[in-house]
Each structure stands twice: as C-alpha cells, then as structure tokens.
C-alpha cells in the first residue's frame, strides 16, 4: 500500500500556502484528486509528489494515491483543506445527475473543518428543504441526499454559520432521473379488425413510459401517419396517445398497422392487421374428424370454431337422432373467445349411453346468414355372444350370434372336459370363421353377425367354444354337450346389459 | 539547551544570490515547524517563510516570493533560505523562529515563534 | 505603513500598569489569533503571548493578552525597568496570506 507524506489523514492550510504532497509506493503511483488549478505533478523513482505554490479553497479535497501494479488494489488518501475565511465551500460540480433511489452527493466540500457543526442544506433562494428529505453531510465530500426522488430535482444552496451569519455556495442542480428500465410500454387496440367497406373504424396506439422523453408513431404499410397525439400524467406515468379514426372504411385502408415508440433504451414496436370485406362472413370449422367413434361409457367434446364478422346474433348445439328427442342439456356446450373474430365452442358428452350416438348439428347465425357443422357420433362395444344347438339341413349344427361394434370377428374353439372357458391346454381344434353373416349393420347401431359350425356328432366329454372380439373387447359362451341335451354357459364376467 | 544558530550572511550586490543556514540543536527538529523572520535596521519585525515540519506545507511573504525559497534537512537539524534576485530593502537581520509546539491551533501555518535565533545581517549593496 | 496599527510609544513608571493597543481589521486579529512579542534592545525578540490571550512557562503573569473584535492589547502591570523594550504584535492576515507584525511600540520606564 503506497504511503503519502505528510502521514496525517487530513491538513489544513491557508490560502496562499505552497503544498507538496508526496507518495512513495514499492512500484510506480498515481495520484487522483479534485480537478482543481495550479497543481504541479512530477515522478521521483517511486514517488509521485503533487505540488502547489498558491493553494487556494478550490484545493480543497481529497487526494488519493494508488498504485496500479499492487494486485490488491491498495490506495492512501489525503484530505487538504484550504481554509478560506471568504470562501467556506467549494464546489466540485454544478450538476449532479442520478437515478431516482440513488444517493446523490452534491459535492460541496467545506473548506474548513471548523465550521462543520453550522452545515446545513437549502434550495435556492433560502428556500427550504422538500419534506422527507432525507441527507447528511461530510466535510469531506459534502452533501448526501439518501434515496433521491424525481420530485427532488431542485437547485440546491450548501450553507455554513461563519460569524453568526450564513454563508451560500453557489447553487447545484441536482437532476433526479426517473429510472426507465426499458423501451416505452405500448398498447395497439384492438389486436385485429376487420369492418365491412363503408363501415367506420378506430385503431388506438398508446405509449407511457416513466420519462417524459419518448416518441411514439403510428404507421401503415411502413408509412408513418399524421395522427394529433394526446398527453398525458397519470399513475406516475407519461402517456402518448395516436387514435386514428376512418369514418368510412375501403379496401386500400386494410393492411398492417405498427404502434412504435422510443426512447433513450431502445424501440418497442407492436402491430395489428385489418382486414376489410365486401360483405359478412360466418365460417365454421373444427379440427376433429366431423365422424366420430367413442366406446360406450367413455366421453367426448365436439369442439367447432367459428369466423365470424359482425358477431354471431344466435347458436347453439342439436342433437339429430336417430335414437330420441332429446337435445344437449345447455350446460355442457361452453362458448370460448380466442379473439374478437374467432370463437370456440365445446359440446361436452359425458360418460356416453348407447342412446346418445348419433348426429349432433352446431348451427350458428349472423348478418351473413346461417351455417352449421354436423359430427357423425358411433359407440363401440365390445362383443356380445351366444351360442345354441340347432339343426340346419338335418345337420347338427353350432349357431354363434356375435353383436358388438365395431364388426366382431369369430373364432370357435373346440377343447377337452367341460369348462367354462378353453385355455391353451386343453385345445383339441381351433376354426377362424373370416366371413360371418352379418345380420344388421345400421347406422350408430351394433352390427351383429351369425357363425355356424357343422357337428356331424357332439362328444359329450369336451366343450365348444365362440369368441368373438373387436377393436374395442371380446366375448365368449360356451356350449357343453351332455346326455340330457346341450348345456351352455356364457362366460362368468360377462355381466354387459343391454 | 534549545538553541538555533544563523550564519550565512554577509554583503551582496543588488540581483545577487545568498543561502542562510539554521542550525538547530536541543530539540526534535524534524517535529517542528520554522520561520524566517527578518529585521531591517531601525525598522520592526517582518515575517519571510514558514516551513512544516515535513515540508510539505510552505508559506511565503508577498514582498520574497518567487525569489526566496525556505527548505530543511530534518537529518541534518537545518534549515536554510536560499535568497535569489536580493534587492537593497531585502537588507535586514534575519532570524529563524521555531514555532510553538501545541498550540489551540488546527491549521498549518505559523503560529507562535517561541524560540528565536540570535539572527544574521544581510547588506545588499553596489 | 504596518497593517496593524500600534502606537509607536508607551511609557509608564514602575509599579504602573501599561497597555498597549494593537488595531487591525476583519481579515486578520477579526479572525485569527494574536501574537505578542518583547524586544529588548540588541537582542532577538521572545514570545510573551500566543493565542490571544496564553502565556508560554517562563513569562510572568504581569503580561496579560486580550482580543475584541479587530483589536487586540498587551497589557503589563506592576511595571518594572527590565519591561522597557520594544513590544510586537502580530496576527495572520487572510487577505494578503501571509503573517503580519504591528510597527512595533517602543515601551519606556521612567
């Protein structure tokens, strides 16, 4: 750490005094201090020795030495007061600027130590001080306002009792800036517009920003337009406001509209686009496929989104058949709005009975006429079967009804002993029938569909089996043949009830 | 005992160059501020210089400045006034001053000159 | 012409008591301290009075100091022959930056 003599941390000298201060550090030094006149700088080896020959208050400060090759960046300081009985302050600036809760340090020095207990701090003019001016002062650097307000961006005067009397610096202006943490906040309204030719139109675009200091236009295509700006101060903030106003609205208006505003931190730009149409328009869609397939027991939402401009006067959810007259309970069809011209509407379905497959219609309205949208609902089910004896033809002959949707396939099983169920063990034969008659196959119904197997002669000690499975499950019986006639069992977990 | 002790003077001619010395004894001189003070014949006292005891602080009378310089040798227990560009109203004894030591005094510059030399003549004359 | 005024003579008889004025202005005894000085003749001048109004040890209580606003005065009672010198006052003047001396007075015991 360097060492500057004389080794006192403060000195106090009359005005005209010559005044050698000197630095010695193990490498070179450097000295900082006030900017102030008549200071003489010469090197000596390893010292520095800052000299003046007529000290006056303006020599009044700190003045420190460091030396820059120390890694540990130590430095020695100085305070030379220059005690001018005509002179008390001096003034290192004549303008500080800070940001608001910043301290700002208004930098009049006193030039003698003596008079610091008489210190205080005025606005110009004897003005007092704002109220919740909080500061405190340093013979050494001055004045501290703590945690400076915008609103305290005043000249101020440093005063000392000298005599009885009060002796003023010459006044500081301290300019407290509003801390701008970015670009202007902008708002566009509306986020996008569409009007019919003819019809009148109003395009918003604000800006606020903390600072008064800001820019703000409104532009079209990259055209930058004439609009009379408002202004405004409210919630402690500058507000600028373009409205651009189209009586009646034509082709060449539509397009894209860019709200930009500025300042010293940059450009904040934001944008919308109109659209103008020959007439109104009302356009229903969905993302879902418009057929549906649901298994029974399960839920669905139909979800439509609609395009419309004038809004919709009128809408609403229909249940088409074919299985009753009931419609959508109100409750489960829910209208969301993405934005001004679009709009979402959901039919939730919940928990799926086999009498609600079916059509259901959304139909909407505007000036532009009606439209709907129709989804196309079907229910799976797992397979239902059953098994009997009969003779076709004078043949001894197996008939399996399947029903269940999507179409079941079958397969017979033909296994050893007497059980419900044939597992792999047990299997004697196995027939895929790939085509089964079908029986029915209507719209939003079950298909059900027939298999027969031919028998020339029933073994009593074995079970033949139908299965009969789809996307959705599958189901199964089981026929035992016994002395006393044929015995059936469908299967134990086979509880479905129509 | 404390003492201080001037030589150096002498007869000069107008523009001409003398050094003063002031030797000091008794005392810690390197902790004491010095003066010159000098005495035209007949005349009253007139303070020249003041040196701190570091040197770093120095006052100088408005009539000498820039023709007297004041410095020290804190090893040597001297202090010296080297008198450049001498004029015939510089003729006067010269004597150096210790200041007083403690005084109610904050500021550098004299004070009190509580131990005095017995002084030496300057003559500047053609 | 000295910047503080003394008046160039005093006189008194022994066992008196003398003062001697010193006037000056805002810029130096206003101010700042006041010195005061003896001379006696062929001799080299020694301190009697230091800020205002203290004595160095060593001068004897007869010599008092004062100050009032731009004047100062060195008053010695109980005079006595050995007092008859030449008497200095002397203060820093902030106008001028420098120390100043009185014209001295010229103190004679009849």
């Known amino acids: 750490i360097p060492v500057i003599e004389p080794s006192v941390p403060e000195l106090v000298v009359k005005p005209g005094a010559t005044v050698t201060l000197r630095c010695v550090g193990n490498g070179s030094v450097e000295w900082d201090g006030p900017p102030s006149p008549h200071w003489t700088l010469y090197s000596d080896g390893s010292s520095s020795i800052l000299s003046t020959n007529n000290a006056t208050f303006q020599n009044t400060g700190t003045y420190r030495c460091t030396e820059p090759g120390d890694p540990l960046g130590g430095s020695a300081a100085i305070h030379l007061y220059v005690k001018d009985p005509a002179r008390p302050w001096n003034v290192l600036a004549q303008e500080v600027v800070v940001f608001e809760d910043q301290d700002a340090l208004l930098p009049c020095l006193l030039t003698d130590p003596v008079l610091e207990a008489g210190v205080s701090l005025v606005r110009v003019r004897g003005r007092p001080l704002m109220r919740h001016t909080n500061y405190s002062f340093s013979p050494w650097h001055g004045f501290t306002i703590h945690r400076a307000k915008f609103i305290q961006s005043q000249d101020y005067q440093c005063s000392a009792l000298m005599g009885g009397r009060k002796v003023m610096s010459i006044s500081i202006r301290l300019k407290v800036q509003k801390v701008i943490p970015g670009p202007p906040a902008l708002t566009l309204v509306p986020a996008e517009l569409v009007r019919i030719r003819g019809e009148a139109a109003q395009i918003v675009c604000s800006a606020s920003s903390v600072d008064v200091n800001f820019d703000v236009f409104l532009q079209h295509n990259n055209t930058k337009l004439a609009i009379p700006q408002q202004s405004d101060f409210h919630n402690n903030r500058y507000q600028k406001v373009l409205t651009l106003n189209l009586d009646q609205v034509d082709f060449q208006h539509a397009g894209n509209y860019s709200c930009v505003a500025s300042n010293v931190q940059g450009k904040h730009s934001t944008s919308m686009f109109f659209r103008v149409v020959e007439s109104a328009y009302l356009n229903l869609s969905s993302e879902q496929n418009l057929i549906q397939e649901v298994t029974v027991g399960e839920g669905l939402n139909l979800k439509v989104m609609v395009e419309a401009y004038p809004g919709l006067q009128g809408f609403n959810w229909t249940y088409l058949g074919p299985f009753s007259d009931h419609q959508p309970e109100p409750k489960l069809a829910n209208a969301t709005t993405k934005d001004t011209y679009r709009h979402t509407f959901t039919l939730s379905l919940p928990r799926l009975k086999p009498s609600e497959a079916g059509r259901y219609s959304f139909l909407a309205r505007n000036p532009g006429g009606w439209r709907a949208l129709t989804f196309e609902l079907t229910l799976r089910y797992p397979p239902e079967v059953s098994v009997i004896w009969t003779f076709i033809n004078g043949s001894g002959t197996l008939l399996c009804a399947a029903s269940g949707y999507p179409q079941p396939n079958v397969t017979w099983l033909q296994c050893s002993g007497h059980t419900d169920r044939c597992d792999e063990a047990q299997v004697l034969q196995v027939w895929d029938d790939p085509y089964p008659e079908v029986l029915s196959q209507e719209p939003f119904h079950k298909v059900t569909v027939q298999s027969l197997l031919t028998v020339e002669t029933l073994e009593h000690n074995q079970t033949y089996e139908c299965r009969a499975h789809n996307s959705v499950g599958s189901g199964s019986w089981a026929f035992i043949p016994i002395s006393a006639g044929a015995h059936t069992h469908p299967p134990d977990e086979f509880l479905f009830t129509p | 005992e404390v003492q201080l002790v001037e030589s150096g003077g002498g007869l000069v001619q107008p523009g001409g160059s003398l050094r003063l010395s002031c030797a000091a004894s008794?005392?810690?001189?390197?902790?004491?501020?010095m003066n010159w003070v000098r005495q035209a014949p007949g005349k009253g006292l007139e303070w020249v210089s003041y040196?701190?005891?570091?040197?770093?602080?120095?006052y100088y009378a408005d009539s000498v400045k820039g023709r007297f310089t004041i410095s020290r040798d804190n090893a040597k227990n001297s202090l010296y006034l080297q008198m450049n560009s001498l004029r015939d109203e510089d003729t006067a004894v010269y004597y150096c001053?210790?200041?007083?030591?403690?005084?109610?005094?904050?500021?550098?510059?004299?004070?009190?000159?509580?131990?005095w030399g017995q002084g030496t003549m300057v003559t500047v004359s053609s | 012409q000295s910047v503080l005024t003394q008046p160039p003579s005093a006189s008194g008889t022994p066992g008196q008591r003398v003062t001697i004025s010193c006037s000056g202005s805002s810029s130096n005894i206003g101010s700042n301290y006041v010195y005061w000085y003896q001379q006696l003749p062929g001799t080299a001048p020694k301190l009697l009075i230091y800020s205002n109004n203290q004595r160095p040890s060593g001068v004897p209580d007869r010599f008092s100091g004062s100050k009032s606003g731009t004047s100062a005065s060195l008053a010695i009672s109980g005079l006595r022959s050995e007092d008859e010198a030449d008497y200095y006052c002397a203060a820093w003047d902030d106008s001028l930056s420098g120390l100043v001396f009185g014209g001295g007075t010229k103190l004679t015991v009849l």
């Open positions: 040196i701190s005891s570091s040197s770093a602080i120095i």
């Open positions: 008794g005392f810690t001189f390197s902790t004491y501020s």
């Open positions: 001053a210790r200041d007083l030591p403690i005084t109610m005094i904050v500021v550098v510059m004299p004070d009190a000159f509580d131990i």
